[in-house]
């Protein structure tokens, strides 16, 4: 039984598919909030990409010890609109700062149970987990 | 032996840590190229985020059947500079369209070997894999 992704020995517990495959998206711990006040809404001329962007964002740590990876980061937009390329500080209402989402594959640790229902260590269960990756300056949607 | 992340039964193979942990980044299959000609360099007023962005991008599939997740997508910038918010087509040289990179946790399928060197199914080996997530409109770096 080397049927990947069981990740268990072929002479192990053939009735168990220990790495369960479930693709139900898992919501993040907190809703992705816009955070327009905690840090000044400006585009820097140095530093990392998220501070030089005209749709700047910060990262918030989401840690879960029963998940792989245990540390995920959610982007939080610092401005509702894009920052002017000219000044780096004034907002341009012609552009919106929008969160870019991604359903990331993660694995959760779950107790495994054998044929007789007894606890047989831990299995990894695959889930899709929605993370916000970045804030992007976009042209507002024109409704048809 | 329920020492996570072996993901194997506690009465399994205590000498094997079946989910091996190695955090050496793995390069993507192809270098992240800038792709300024394959799609027109413009910001749409509808459609998905990557086409409405003033730093638009397309996605390139990276599939590896021995990796979890098997499908990853790399962003490829369509413009070297940001597109004007006013016109949605002309480029504004005051802004650069830059790739946002992320070291994503992935798992590779590897043959496992028991104490006697015999093949015991498959293990999952954790690696960090660099993916480009999106293209972001940034103010150019001012060198001090």
């Amino acid at each position: 039984y080397s049927h990947w992704p069981s990740c268990c020995p072929s002479k192990g517990y053939p009735s168990e598919e220990l790495l369960r495959w479930s693709t139900v998206p898992v919501p993040p711990l907190k809703p992705a909030s816009l955070d327009f006040h905690s840090v000044s809404c400006r585009a820097s001329e140095d530093g990392p990409l998220n501070s030089r962007a005209i749709s700047p964002w910060r990262y918030e740590l989401d840690r879960d010890l029963n998940r792989l990876p245990q540390d995920l980061y959610h982007a939080r937009c610092l401005c509702p609109h894009c920052v002017s390329l000219q000044t780096g500080s004034h907002m341009d209402p012609r552009g919106n700062s929008e969160l870019l989402y991604h359903n990331q594959t993660v694995f959760y640790r779950r107790p495994c149970h054998g044929k007789k229902g007894n606890h047989k260590g831990y299995c990894l269960e695959r889930r899709l987990y929605r993370v916000s990756l970045a804030c992007v300056c976009v042209r507002p949607r024109v409704m048809g | 032996y329920s020492h996570w992340p072996s993901c194997c039964p506690s009465k399994g193979y205590p000498s094997e840590e079946l989910l091996r942990w190695s955090t050496v980044p793995v390069p993507p299959l192809k270098p992240a190229s800038l792709d300024f000609h394959s799609v027109s360099c413009r910001a749409s007023e509808d459609g998905p985020l990557n086409s409405r962005a003033i730093s638009p991008w397309r996605y390139e599939l990276d599939r590896d059947l021995n990796r979890l997740p098997q499908d990853l997508y790399h962003a490829r910038c369509l413009c070297p500079h940001c597109v004007s918010l006013q016109t949605g087509s002309h480029m504004d040289p005051r802004g650069n369209s830059e790739l946002l990179y992320h070291n994503q946790t992935v798992f590779y399928r590897r043959p496992c070997h028991g104490k006697k060197g015999n093949h015991k199914g498959y293990c999952l080996e954790r690696r960090l894999y660099r993916v480009s997530l999106a293209c972001v409109c940034v103010r150019p770096r001012v060198m001090g």
Partner: antibody, heavy 122, light 107 residues
């Protein structure tokens, strides 16, 4: 040798702000998250938050009601703690502490700065 | 927040004694518990991580045990240099929380 060196003692008035620095050396600064822990006189240790120098990602103790801001300067391998709207009960020693981890079982503060005494008094 | 409670708050023992300090969590934290030692006027030092793993350089007379909500730090044979305050800390969930500390003295 891993070292965390904090800035000197501060005396502040209620309502003011304080910014404490923590200079790291002897390891890859961006490879480890940095925690900040406070110890008021005769009190237990109190975790304030952490920051990942690699991407600036943070997690804060909400008990500080948004008064804490953590930042880093990776080029100087330095972490900063800023505490606003100071009150007398904020008097104490403020520690930075590097967080070691193995990726699945433990997160532990293995190296600590020498501490910065902040006194809030009118 | 997860509350951590240590007992006793202080204790006095003789050199060579076996000393036990307990730490109780307000909810199950699996084995996600660390112990720190803080000598008078000094900085806290990591002693034990993940309930029972000894940090490098820590003498083998220190050991940790427990799971779920109840944890123990044991010093098998107390030495004069062990005079300190000991803190447990959970890291299952943010915010990290510490016990109130146990002050250990020599009789």
């Amino acid at each position: 040798e891993v070292q965390l060196v904090e800035s000197g003692a501060e005396v502040k008035k209620p309502g003011a702000s304080v910014k404490v620095s923590c200079k790291a050396s002897g390891y890859s600064f961006s490879g480890y998250t940095m925690n900040w822990v406070r110890q008021a006189p005769g009190q237990r240790l109190e975790w304030m938050g952490l920051i990942n120098p690699y991407n600036g990602g943070t997690s804060y103790n909400q008990n500080f009601k948004g008064r804490v801001t953590l930042t880093v300067d990776t080029s100087a391998s330095t972490a900063y703690l800023e505490l606003n709207s100071l009150r007398s009960e904020d008097t104490g020693v403020y520690y930075c502490a590097r967080e070691d981890y193995d990726g699945y079982l433990y997160f532990a503060m293995d190296y600590w700065g020498q501490g910065t005494l902040v006194t809030v008094s009118s | 927040d997860i509350q951590m409670t240590q007992s006793p708050s202080s204790l006095s023992a003789s050199v060579g004694d076996r000393v036990t300090i307990t730490c109780s969590a307000s909810q199950g934290i699996s084995n996600y518990l660390n112990w720190y030692q803080q000598k008078p006027g000094k900085v806290p030092k990591l002693l034990i991580y993940y309930t029972s793993s000894l940090h490098s350089g820590v003498p083998s007379r220190f050991s940790g045990s427990g799971s779920g909500t109840d944890f123990t730090l044991t010093i098998s044979s107390l030495q004069p240099e062990d005079v300190a305050t000991y803190y447990c800390q959970q890291y299952l969930a943010f915010p990290y929380t510490f016990g109130q500390g146990t002050k250990l003295e020599i009789k």
